[in-house]
């Protein structure tokens, strides 16, 4: 937990916030919790970004104030108004950007005190891979698709069967830039497949983890996908 | 069309005083960051300072911290760089620098000489 | 303070060539650059802004490349009014910085 001290004779009060990540063309949550106060009107709510010259978003007195937000952010923000009360200073960015990565600081002012907390916010681009049998190629083969990545991730094939074999040898990844110039599509083919095996197909870069099983038996294929977002920590 | 002008840089003695201005047209002013970036004869680019378009929020180089004080009149669409304890090293040409719609260094001024000499 | 090292600082090309300028930031910057044209005795000019947007007005020959601390210029087809110093500038973290300049001369 990180504490901001207390000013002016005022006590300090605890802010939590939890790194988390934002995929790109998306809507993001900045999440930020704090004591809450028995009075909406005395809470004051500011989201501050490393290199911004403008604030991020206010909202004081029961509503926004936007005249100090800084033009990068104009019309993206938003708090969950009704949950102030409580405590909740989540921070809704829509539309997340590339450049929205970095360090963020949630600031609190009650009548209880003062405090504040940073988060990282990560960006990228993130997708559920789909695996199907590729049955226009002349031997047994999956293909993996997934549609946005960013950065690069890197692909890896495994199977239930042959556990900690290296498949990088049958496979063959590409990379194929989407018409936005920053994200890709990722397709991976895997070659000389046997029936009745599961194999997984998993993409990884920093922001996030992503596989996607198929199992083929000779009467049916069953299909599942996963994601999870790396490194969400809270401060 | 925006607009940037610079004006009030000149010859000052070390440890002197000067305030320079700019003068934005062509663009709702109070909206944007604005910025100011030197460039020392026949050098590179410096980032000097900056300030949001409410004008709460300010910014600087740790070498001028103390020094200079950015501001802005936004019922004037002007913007200010006062300078004091003026070095030899600030001699450059000061650059008005203005944000737009997605980045800080979109529209620049042409410039005003600021000379620190005795 | 994040250092922003430009490369080369100076290159001799010929009109019609493809030039790569490259920047290497001391941390990574999330695409929060910018690539800057200016020449003799004038203000420096935006031409991309984010990494990889190109400024209105900005020909088509010049692109920006590059995520996380690595990012490059690129004028695809050398013009005669590209020779000029292109500048990279880093807006992620104050103080915001410059790469040292890269001048492309006339070979």
């Known amino acids: 937990l990180i504490i901001g001290f207390g000013i002016s004779g005022r006590h300090s009060i605890t802010v939590t916030t939890v790194a988390s990540a934002g995929n790109i063309g998306e809507d993001g949550i900045l999440s930020c919790t704090f004591e809450p106060d028995i009075k909406l009107s005395d809470i004051v709510i500011q989201w501050l970004k490393e290199g911004v010259l403008g604030l991020v978003h206010e909202f004081k007195e029961g509503k926004d104030e936007l005249s100090e937000q800084d033009e990068m952010f104009r019309g993206r923000t938003a708090v969950f108004a009704d949950q102030v009360i409580v405590g909740n200073a989540s921070l809704r960015l829509k539309n997340v950007q590339l450049t929205d990565a970095g360090t963020y600081k949630c600031y609190i002012i009650t009548s209880k005190g003062k405090g504040n907390a940073n988060l990282e916010y990560k960006t990228g681009a993130f997708s559920m891979p789909e695996v199907n049998v590729d049955y226009n190629a002349s031997s047994e083969t999956l293909r993996c698709e997934a549609p946005r990545w960013f950065p690069q991730p890197t692909v890896v094939w495994a199977s239930q069967v042959d556990q900690g074999a290296n498949f990088s040898e049958v496979s063959n990844t590409s990379f194929e830039l989407n018409s936005e110039n920053v994200t890709m599509k990722v397709v991976s083919v895997l070659y000389n497949v046997t029936i009745n095996n599961t194999y997984s197909c998993m993409i990884e870069n920093d922001i996030a983890k992503a596989t996607g099983d198929i199992k083929v038996t000779e009467s049916e294929i069953k299909r599942r996908s996963h994601l999870q977002l790396l490194n969400s920590k809270a401060s | 069309e925006v607009q940037l002008l610079e004006s009030g840089g000149g010859l000052v003695q070390p440890g002197g005083s000067l305030r320079l201005s700019c003068a934005a047209s062509?663009?709702?002013?109070?909206?944007?960051?604005m910025s100011w970036v030197r460039q020392a004869p026949g050098k590179g680019l410096e980032w000097v300072s900056g300030i949001n378009g409410g004008g709460s929020y300010t910014y600087y180089l740790d070498t001028v911290k103390g020094r200079f004080t950015i501001s802005r009149d936004n019922a004037r669409n002007t913007l200010y760089l006062q300078m004091s304890s003026l070095r030899a090293e600030d001699t450059a040409v000061y650059y008005c620098?203005?944000?737009?719609?997605?980045?800080?260094?979109?529209?620049w001024g042409q410039g005003t000489l600021v000379t620190v000499s005795s | 303070d994040i250092r922003m090292t430009q490369s080369p600082s100076s290159l001799s090309a010929s009109v019609g060539d493809r030039v790569t300028i490259t920047c290497h930031a001391s941390q990574g910057i999330s695409s929060n650059i910018g690539w800057l044209q200016q020449k003799p005795g004038k203000a420096p000019k935006a031409l991309i802004y984010h990494g990889t947007n190109l400024e209105d007005g900005v020909p088509s020959r010049f692109s920006g490349s590059g995520s996380g601390a690595d990012y490059t210029l690129t004028i695809s087809s050398l013009q005669p009014e590209d020779f000029a110093t292109y500048y990279c500038?880093?807006?992620?973290?104050?103080?915001?910085?410059f790469g040292g300049g890269t001048k492309v001369e006339i070979k």
């Open positions: 500038v880093q807006y992620a973290q104050f103080p915001y910085t």
């Open positions: 062509g663009f709702t002013f109070s909206r944007y960051g």
């Open positions: 620098v203005s944000q737009g719609s997605n980045y800080y260094f979109d529209y």
